[in-house]
């Protein structure tokens, strides 16, 4: 069935998914399974930050330009519980989590773990918001590429129970001994979808703002004790942020979070919504986004009701851009698109018709051009300005979705779709 109007990843939960996993295991011929290195001139480091230790604190993965390039690569999915959470999200038995762990548990992403920050420069900051069923580590291809071009990227792990899994510490003593409290994805009844998704997107926006405040506090020299005992000195971040150059980026539910965050927090100068799922947003936000906003969509995820809501963000006095990546699917923005070979990736809808590296490259370059323009960066990202306009053989300017049919419009905006 397909009820993506109220669930952007419903297609992953069909009973066929179990068969697909079995095929995945049987084939196990992954082919190209590497998360790509950043294309920019900077080496990239990675660390995690949790402050404070409670579920009301901030938890994020930080990608940043690093001083050296000789550290161990970063473990992509760092705890077994994340695999259990993914199996719950996919609607499979928790044992499937162990199989996923077997397949992906030792996979790394090309960032130097706990490498020192490259000093001597103030970096623009991007706060990144993950999609439903994801968590802070699953968009490393985007985070690493941005960091390789001179950004500090804070990939938030949301505690609104939209992540497959996340953890916190009940108290200080639990934090000291590393006794994690795990929080798993919340499955909603249909009658809860509207109000809970809206509450979640509001909390997510607050978590993005809180992450920004924390990093700006550290930048100002406020001593912050990371609840995670890691060999990265947060004091390195003092005076490292270009405090006027801050953006928010997110995928799917994270795309809605971008819009909610922009409407609430003017410190974010612009936003990029990657294949945004608009359903969680309340009607009041559309007219309250003064900052420039860029929609980068996949070809096969979007549908009329969603595009109509994106268009509601438009007004003559506001900077709005939209492009669609030809042959792309919803999962082209997340790392799982790189975790399997072509055939299996296609079967699982992790890959589209377009090569995954080409798709993420287009998205990243268009994003960099947009960020340069609206954060006032003195870089060479304007070489990709044409991508913002959709001027490329693999791009569609605007959208491929027809929203002029009133019948479709009304049918899809009701919020209740029948199972197909």
């Amino acid at each position: 069935f397909d009820w993506q109007y109220i669930n952007p990843v419903a297609h992953m939960k069909s009973s066929a998914w179990v068969n697909k996993i079995q095929v995945l295991m049987a084939a196990a011929s992954f082919g190209q399974t590497k998360i790509p290195r950043g294309n920019g001139p900077y080496s990239v480091g990675c660390t995690d930050l949790m402050f404070d230790h409670t579920n009301k604190g901030t938890f994020l993965r930080l990608y940043y330009p690093s001083q050296d390039n000789d550290r161990l690569d970063t473990l992509w999915i760092p705890n077994k519980e994340y695999f259990w959470g993914l199996s719950k999200f996919l609607g499979t038995h928790w044992l499937m989590g162990n199989i996923l762990r077997l397949l992906f548990g030792s996979m790394t992403t090309p960032a130097n773990w706990n490498s020192p920050l490259r000093p001597g420069e103030k970096y623009p900051l991007v706060v990144f918001s993950h999609g439903l069923g994801a968590f802070r580590t699953l968009y490393s291809a985007i985070g690493i590429d941005l960091a390789s071009h001179g950004f500090i990227v804070a990939a938030v792990e949301h505690r609104d129970r939209s992540a497959s899994a996340t953890y916190y510490f009940k108290d200080q003593s639990a934090a000291e001994i590393g006794d994690k409290s795990w929080l798993y994805l919340r499955t909603l009844k249909q009658e809860e979808e509207t109000h809970i998704r809206n509450e979640q997107v509001r909390q997510r926006a607050k978590e993005c703002s809180q992450a920004l405040s924390l990093i700006l506090d550290i930048d100002h020299g406020k001593p912050v004790k990371n609840a995670l005992d890691l060999k990265f000195d947060m004091e390195q971040l003092k005076d490292s942020i270009d405090r006027e150059k801050i953006a928010v980026i997110g995928h799917s539910f994270g795309g809605a979070t971008v819009i909610q965050t922009l409407s609430e927090d003017q410190r974010f100068r612009c936003g990029i919504a990657l294949d945004a799922w608009m359903f969680p947003l309340g009607d009041e936000v559309y007219s309250r986004i003064p900052q420039p906003l860029f929609f980068i969509n996949s070809e096969y995820f979007q549908y009329p009701a969603n595009i109509i809501k994106m268009k509601k963000c438009y007004s003559p006095d506001k900077e709005r851009k939209m492009i669609t990546i030809r042959g792309s699917v919803h999962q082209n923005f997340a790392d799982f698109t790189f975790a399997t070979g072509k055939i299996i990736g296609h079967m699982l809808k992790l890959k589209g018709d377009i090569d995954s590296n080409v798709a993420i490259d287009l998205s990243n370059k268009a994003s960099l051009a947009f960020l340069q323009k609206h954060l006032g960066l003195h870089k060479d990202f304007d070489q990709w300005d044409c991508l913002i306009e959709g001027d490329d053989e693999n791009l569609i300017p605007g959208t491929n979705i027809n929203t002029t049919n009133q019948h479709i419009m009304l049918q899809n905006s009701s919020g209740i779709e029948k199972y197909n």
Epitope: D160, K170, K189, K206
Partner: antibody, heavy 121, light 107 residues
Framework: EVKLEESGPELKKPGETVKISCKAS????????VHWVKQAPGKGLKWMGW????????TFADDFKGRFAFSLETSTSTAYLQINNLKNEDTATYFC??????????????WGQGISVTVSS | DIVLTQTHKFMSTSVGDRVNITCKAS??????VAWYQQKPGQSPKLLIK???TRHTGVPDRFTGSGSGTDYIFTISSVQAEDLALYYC?????????FGGGTKLEIK
Amino acid sequence: EVKLEESGPELKKPGETVKISCKASGYTFTDYSVHWVKQAPGKGLKWMGWINTDTGEPTFADDFKGRFAFSLETSTSTAYLQINNLKNEDTATYFCARGDNYLYYYTMDYWGQGISVTVSS
Amino acid sequence: DIVLTQTHKFMSTSVGDRVNITCKASQDVNTAVAWYQQKPGQSPKLLIKWASTRHTGVPDRFTGSGSGTDYIFTISSVQAEDLALYYCQQHYSTPWTFGGGTKLEIK
């Protein structure tokens, strides 16, 4: 339909203990928190605190630390408020209300009918 | 703790009138303001959350607005059944706090 049903009125003497209940129905009990609110006769509303129905962890407002306890019976979807060493100023109507365990800006959307507790010697 | 002040303890109105009830917070509560209606002998009923979002089933004559520290609850055309106590509440940070209440009366 979401419902919170509270137990009947209580008449107690100073120094005694009262335990009042709030039975929830119409939703998944362990997804939503239970809050307690006090309303003294002719007065406004005062938030006492809440209990996380997933973990059982209670949180109290400063004025309600010490003599007050929140507890759960998850099997029957029931939350309890216990007040020890009752004082005259505990005379009030006590409301339970639904919040959310992890959405920490989620306000109290459904309320019980209220339980009148009278403390008099 | 965040203090909420409802300046008017009582407000007189007539059926069909438009009425505004104000609520001022001692600090920015980021639109996390709810409005409740309480009739005599009943429990409070949520009308508005997040300053302007109507709760399920609430008639559209009830609206809310505001941001920062200043919030307004409006009944566009008062009905006889709207005579009640109205409380604002902040759901931004614990301890959650309520305003003192505004009693709506018929002239």
